[in-house]
């Protein structure tokens, strides 16, 4: 598994660091997450041709991944800080069910899964400290989360494989948005 | 070959219109983040805007904001600039170019720029 | 926008000489940052990214170092062919460069 985020060795070096903003942490957690996240799809790309299949294949998968629209503010145009951070959180936590799915898709990186879970909780509870309306976010019901599990679950193996690339993708291309986003607040 | 050609350049008169293609081979645009940068003639490298494959999220530049847009059709697998309200100061060779799949990102892959001259 | 400023503008020296040019962020921009070569009537080509990382088939001549707000290029023993313009680019928010540094012979 990768450093975890905090202090990495450019950091240590510097004994009179100011200790990290909140922004800066949130930034950190985001990008570690991220390298998590690219160790998984090798593993993914390297085991099966999902990675080579394009993107209209894919979409027509019917998982319902959560993805950034115009409406959620979080573009430079129609920005709306808190619109944003609204769904940025809420879309995390509706990826953890997915997070959840891959912990047993990996051999050799099973760590890594763990971590991109693991550090993807704590995400959620950095930005939802930064946010103002908690009340606006919506938590996946518990119930229908545990019958998608279920039914990911019972995929045969060539979908569970798509599933897999699937998720990576979708949520690296989440964080990534969110990055972008997070930096004009 | 993975490539970037631009096209569309020329002469315009202040307060005009232009649309800048940048075509893609070799790879996919809607699996990559692309960006304009443009250089004034004997001038440095201004970054103009890009565009962030997944849903399409544009950035631009306080110097084109509400002037230029950015957009692409993925079947053309093609990228293009629409600059309006041109001013002379927008006179520049503009490339097209790639950002990197990495975070943090640079630029992997340059165009070989289509030259913009605005004068009446 | 995030400003980029690059120091010296202008830079004279010999072959074999050690060089630096600086770059200075606005804002902290963290290891989000790339340097660029620029020959005239050529398009940019990358050197360094991440602050630090040597592009592949890049001369080990070339190093780059800082994180935050300052970051510094280095060439140890410059060649014929260094002689060239320099650009620093961020990616944190936006890409915007550095005004340039001309390295002329002196």
């Known amino acids: 598994a990768p450093v975890p985020p905090g202090e990495d060795s450019k950091d240590v070096a510097a004994p009179h660091r100011q200790p990290l903003t909140s922004s800066e942490r949130i930034d950190k957690q985001i990008r570690y997450i991220l390298d998590g996240i690219s160790a998984l799809r090798k593993e993914t790309c390297n085991k099966s041709n999902m990675c080579e299949s394009s993107k209209e294949a894919l979409a027509e998968n019917n998982l319902n991944l959560p993805k950034m629209a115009e409406k959620d503010g979080c573009f430079q145009s129609g920005f709306n800080e808190e619109t944003c951070l609204v769904k940025i959180i809420t879309g995390l936590l509706e990826f953890e069910v997915y997070l959840e799915y891959l912990q047993n898709r990996f051999e050799s990186s099973e760590e890594q899964a763990r971590a991109v879970q693991m550090s993807t909780k704590v995400l959620i509870q950095f930005l939802q400290k930064k946010a103002k309306n908690l009340d606006a976010i919506t938590t996946p019901d518990p119930t229908t989360n545990a019958s998608l599990l279920t039914k990911l679950q019972a995929q045969n193996q060539w979908l569970q494989d798509m599933t897999t690339h699937l998720i990576l993708r979708s949520f690296k291309e989440f964080l990534q948005s969110s990055l972008r986003a997070l930096r004009q607040m | 070959e993975v490539q970037l050609v631009e096209s569309g350049g020329g002469l315009v008169q202040p307060g005009g219109s232009l649309r800048l293609s940048c075509a893609a081979s070799?790879?996919?645009?809607?699996?990559?983040?692309m960006i304009w940068v443009r250089q004034a003639p004997g001038k440095g490298l201004e970054w103009v805007s890009d565009?962030?494959?997944?849903?399409?999220?544009?950035y631009y530049a306080d110097s084109v904001k509400g002037r230029f847009t950015m957009s692409r059709d993925i079947s053309k697998n093609t990228v293009y600039l629409q600059m309006n309200s041109l001013r002379a100061e927008d006179t520049a060779v503009y490339y097209c170019?790639?950002?990197?799949?990495?975070?943090?990102?640079?630029?992997?892959?340059w165009g070989r720029g289509t030259l913009v001259t605005v004068s009446s | 926008d995030i400003q980029m400023t690059q120091s010296p503008s202008t830079l004279s020296a010999s072959v074999g000489d050690r060089v630096t040019i600086t770059c200075r962020a606005s804002?902290?921009?963290?290891?989000?940052l790339a340097w660029y070569q620029q020959k005239p009537g050529k398009a940019p080509k990358v050197l360094i990214y991440k602050a630090s990382t040597l592009e592949s088939g890049v001369p080990s001549r070339f190093s780059g170092s800082g994180s935050g707000t300052e970051f510094t290029l280095t060439i140890s023993s410059l060649q014929p062919d260094d002689f060239a313009t320099y650009y620093c680019?961020?990616?944190?928010?936006?890409?915007?460069f550095g005004q340039g540094t001309k390295l002329e012979i002196k």
């Open positions: 170019a790639r950002w990197a799949d990495d975070h943090p990102p640079w630029i992997d892959l």
């Open positions: 070799g790879f996919t645009i809607s699996s990559n983040y």
């Open positions: 804002q902290g921009i963290s290891s989000w």
């Open positions: 680019q961020q990616s944190w928010l936006g890409g915007s």
């Open positions: 565009l962030y494959y997944y849903a399409g999220d544009t």
